[in-house]
């Protein structure tokens, strides 16, 4: 099994992931590990020799890089906020603030806007990555109600008056609860004639 | 060389506020970010937050948030950790520090008194 | 948040003692921990980071090791100057934690 450098006819190297094709002497190289680059170059009697990024700079992979990539911080003015440090292994980790959604996407997201209003009687779809998409409003299923415009408010189920031990006054809808009322308050007057019957 | 040099002791009444500064100096004050680390009589390290004084940008620990705001002048190359509604559980070593996988430079702490 | 567990709280050790204390993180958190040195009145200081890397200036008898969840530091043979109190963090992810701490006593 041969060790980097060694000759290789066919342009290509048995690890492609830590290894590298050298075409000027024809050579499979070391690549460098995450968090370091390359000081000096393989030879055919000599293997790449890597050093340690220095602080504030990293490289994510295996690499035959000259240099390490400078971290930056995420852009708040594009919505994003910080969620992990730049190490020299990795670049920031960064995702949209709460109540933004990812609008433009380049290989990581680089600018959120605000989540849309879902209006009462709605809710927003769960959905399985945070700051992934916009807001789908769904409608709060039965038994439940939601009665605020907001992009975060989720549908509460009514208020079920019997466990407090009182009665129901007027029933829950989507958007609004249920009313109870005390069951020895008298009924309105409207409703006062069903009674002595 | 890295220094991190701090502001004096303070005496605060529960309620008030207090503001601590760090004056940064032998590196690019814009391009490292500085945290603030506090530290309980006998207890363990608790991690406050940071700015990026490039874009004077803070983010904090949602343990503070609300109380405690972190600034930066550039102009002075100094950061300023600024607490508020103190209360006795507040009395603690407010450290600054520059980070780097981890933090290899501190400043030498601020030790703040809370009674009233 | 990453809960971060040292053991043990604190610990009796003579000069010459090889000493190792363990950290054990909630949640995975690679190899982003790092190990300070902490004497009274004093700030901590910076030994490992990377879990493994031994700060520059930090004597050889110092060392780290692990990844994902349970790190450890040790110390080869224990020196005066190394009585004092060790703490572990991550720098993974917002909020940085750190572990409670280990007192490190003179027997």
């Known amino acids: 099994q041969a060790v980097p450098p060694y000759a290789s006819e066919n342009q290509t190297c048995r690890d492609q992931e830590k290894e590298y094709y050298e075409p000027q002497h024809r050579i499979c190289c070391s690549r460098c590990p995450p968090g370091t680059y390359v000081s000096a170059k393989c030879s055919r009697i000599r293997d790449t020799v890597c050093a340690t990024c220095a602080e504030n700079s990293y490289n994510e992979h295996w690499n035959y890089l000259t240099i390490c990539q400078l971290c930056r911080p995420c852009d708040p003015v594009m919505g994003l906020e910080e969620i992990a440090p730049c190490t020299s292994k990795r670049k920031t980790q960064c995702r949209c603030q709460p109540g933004m959604f990812c609008a433009a996407w380049a290989l990581e997201c680089t600018h959120c806007e605000l989540l849309s209003d879902c209006p009462p009687g709605t809710e927003a779809e769960l959905k399985d990555e945070v700051g992934k998409g916009n807001n789908h409003c769904v409608p709060c299923k039965a038994g439940h109600f939601q009665n605020t415009s907001s992009p975060s408010a989720r549908c509460q189920p009514h208020t079920r008056c019997e466990n407090q031990g009182l009665v129901e006054a007027a029933p829950g809808t989507a958007q609004s609860d249920t009313t109870c009322k005390n069951p020895l308050e008298p009924l309105p007057p409207e409703m006062s004639g069903t009674m002595l019957m | 060389q890295v220094q991190l040099v701090q502001s004096g002791a303070e005496v605060k009444k529960p309620g008030q506020s207090v503001k601590v500064s760090c004056k940064a100096s032998g590196y690019t004050f814009t391009t490292y970010y500085l945290h603030w680390v506090r530290q309980a009589p006998g207890q363990g390290l608790e991690w406050m937050g940071w700015i990026y004084p490039g874009n004077v940008h803070a983010q904090y620990n949602e343990k503070f948030k609300g109380r405690v705001t972190i600034t930066a002048d550039k102009s002075t190359s100094t950061a300023y950790m600024e607490l508020s509604s103190l209360r006795s559980e507040d009395t603690a070593v407010y450290y600054c520090?520059?980070?780097?996988?981890?933090?290899?430079?501190w400043g030498q702490g601020t030790t703040v008194t809370v009674s009233s | 948040d990453i809960q971060m567990t040292q053991s043990p709280s604190s610990l009796s050790a003579s000069v010459g003692d090889r000493v190792t204390i363990t950290c054990k993180a909630s949640?995975?958190?690679?190899?982003?921990v790092a190990w300070y040195q902490q004497k009274p009145g004093k700030a901590p200081k910076l030994l490992i980071s990377?879990?493994?890397y031994r700060y520059s200036g930090v004597p050889s008898r110092f060392s780290g090791s692990g990844s994902g969840t349970d790190f450890t530091l040790t110390i080869s043979s224990l020196q005066p100057e190394d009585f004092a109190t060790y703490f572990c963090?991550?720098?993974?992810?917002?909020?940085?934690?750190f572990g409670q701490g280990t007192k490190v006593e003179i027997k």
């Open positions: 949640q995975n958190v690679g190899i982003n």
């Open positions: 963090q991550q720098y993974d992810t917002y909020p940085f934690t």
């Open positions: 990377s879990a493994s």
């Open positions: 520090a520059r980070s780097w996988e981890g933090f290899p430079y």
